[in-house]
Interface confidence: low
């Protein structure tokens, strides 16, 4: 099943997020991803936990998962590089870099997103955009088209309250409010974009969604700049 969904969001403007990727397993959407370089997509490490012998591919230039679109192209994965410290039972270091079989053909609907290198927290209250494909209602209907939602960043102290995530949010993670609008499970690996810059990647730990006391957790890309650069080099 797809790992995640956008909760309480709306259909995104077609191809307005040219960095958006669908990480696919055996031809079906599995996780979100974000194009960070011509040949590299950033996602979440946990996404491939259950992939085993399945075929992992990356879809770029898509708005609809099923309809033909001139900009759409499915790329094979040459190499999957999970963060060396990622572990199945924690949300820490939940990053994955996927090297495409070739450089992506860039255009208006396919373009890498600049990512944050300055290791400084996003100001609480900043509205950030999360997008993804996945289940959108309790009947299990998956949207064919990309959905998105705007979420305010939540300060770490609040996120770490005993009633919230109880100290689990390290300096390498950030939170966004989850009051009825939220990212959830299978949007894992998708981008949290603030001011046109990639700030976070949706973590793929299991978490109740849409509940204000369980904020969304995102891996701060700036905290992993050295690792990303070393893999992309």
């Amino acid at each position: 099943p797809p790992r995640g969904r956008i909760l309480g969001g709306r259909e995104a403007e077609a191809h307005a997020r040219p960095y958006m990727a669908s990480v696919q397993l055996n031809g079906a959407h599995l996780c979100g991803g974000v194009l960070v370089a011509e040949q590299w997509v950033l996602s979440a490490a946990h996404c491939l936990e259950d992939a085993a012998d399945g075929k992992v591919q990356v879809l770029l230039g898509a708005h609809s998962l099923s309809q033909p679109e001139p900009s759409k192209r499915l790329y094979d994965v040459l190499r999957a590089v999970p963060h060396p410290d990622s572990q199945p039972d924690t949300i820490d270091h939940d990053l994955l870099l996927l090297q495409l079989s070739e450089k992506a053909t860039l255009g208006p609907a396919v373009r890498p997103l600049p990512w944050q290198r300055v290791d400084r927290d996003v100001a609480p209250g900043t509205l950030c955009d999360v997008a993804g494909w996945g289940i959108v209602n309790h009947a299990g209907r998956r949207p064919d088209s990309l959905q998105h939602v705007l979420l305010p960043v939540l300060d770490r102290a609040t996120c770490n309250r005993r009633t919230h995530h109880d100290g689990a949010i390290t300096e390498r993670l950030m939170c966004a409010e989850s009051n009825r609008r939220d990212s959830c499970k299978g949007d894992s690996g998708g981008p949290l974009v603030c001011g046109g810059v990639l700030e976070g990647v949706v973590t793929s730990g299991s978490r109740v969604c849409g509940n204000r006391k369980k904020p969304g957790i995102y891996t701060r890309v700036a905290s992993y700049a050295a690792w990303i650069d070393s893999v992309l080099a």
């Epitope: 969904r5 909760l7 309480g8 959108v136 209602n137 309790h138 705007l150 409010e177 009051n179 009825r180 609008r181 939220d182 959830c184 969604c209 849409g210 509940n211 204000r212 006391k213």
Partner: antibody
């Protein structure tokens, strides 16, 4: 077909606690993807959301009423209740219970698809 | 004051089009829903998620939400459409919020 029905005293004295119960038939209040709400309407005025209780029992209250309002439930009777303390004449209103439909999660409020007929509560000595 | 602003009253001739607006700075982020409330009755959902009609609601009722203004349109208003109309969305805390209501008179 879901039906909701409010019950409780129509007259409450100032400073006392207003207590209302909503009985739900045709569907369980523990069903996923629904919450249950209290909404009020003062005479000649608009609707005011007071609070919700989600299918898992968690509650959400209007910030303006949070210090005075409590919503609870009794799943064995398929009922949920409203308590509003320290009432004044300003709390005179028609009180509605309603089902809150969520399309995404157990608590992602969208719209109210079933309403009770409402009960008028007057606060007066 | 409500986070959603509606005109208090609106008159329309029978058979003409009535447009009831609901203004709010968070409407671009949130869906709008509309309820019809006839005198002495409970509100009834007539449009949800900006523009979707529940089953049994006549086609003359339609909705839109653009640029911070949600609009309920009644094309060819009938005498039985005379009622109060309430818009509902979410406020900055993502809590449910209602407009003040619009009293529609069909002449």
């Amino acid at each position: 077909q879901v039906q909701v029905q409010e019950s409780g005293p129509g007259l409450v004295k100032p400073s006392q606690t207003l207590s209302l119960t909503c009985t739900v038939s045709g569907g369980s209040i523990s069903t996923s993807y629904y919450a249950w709400s209290w909404i009020r309407q003062p005479p000649g005025k608009g609707l005011e959301w007071m609070g919700d209780i989600a299918n898992d029992g968690s509650t959400y209250y209007s910030p303006s009423l949070e210090s005075r309002v409590t919503i609870s439930r009794d799943t064995s009777k398929n009922q949920f209740s409203l308590q509003l303390s320290s009432v004044t004449a300003q709390d005179t209103a028609v009180y509605y219970c309603a089902r809150l439909r969520s399309l995404y999660t157990d608590y992602d409020p969208h719209y109210y698809d079933y309403w009770g007929q409402g009960t008028l509560v007057t606060v007066s000595s | 004051s409500s986070a959603l602003t509606q005109p208090p009253a609106l008159s329309v001739s029978k058979g003409q089009t009535a447009r009831i607006t609901c203004q709010g700075n968070l409407l671009p982020r949130h869906y709008a829903h509309w309820y019809q409330q006839k005198t002495g009755q409970a509100p009834k959902l007539i449009v949800y998620d900006d523009n979707i009609r529940p089953s049994g609601i006549p086609e003359r009722f339609s909705g839109s939400n653009s640029g911070g203004v949600a609009t309920l349109t009644i094309s060819g208003a009938q005498a039985e459409d005379e009622a109060d109309y309430h818009c509902q969305s979410a406020d900055s805390n993502d809590d449910a919020v209602f407009g003040g209501g619009t009293q529609l008179t069909v002449l």
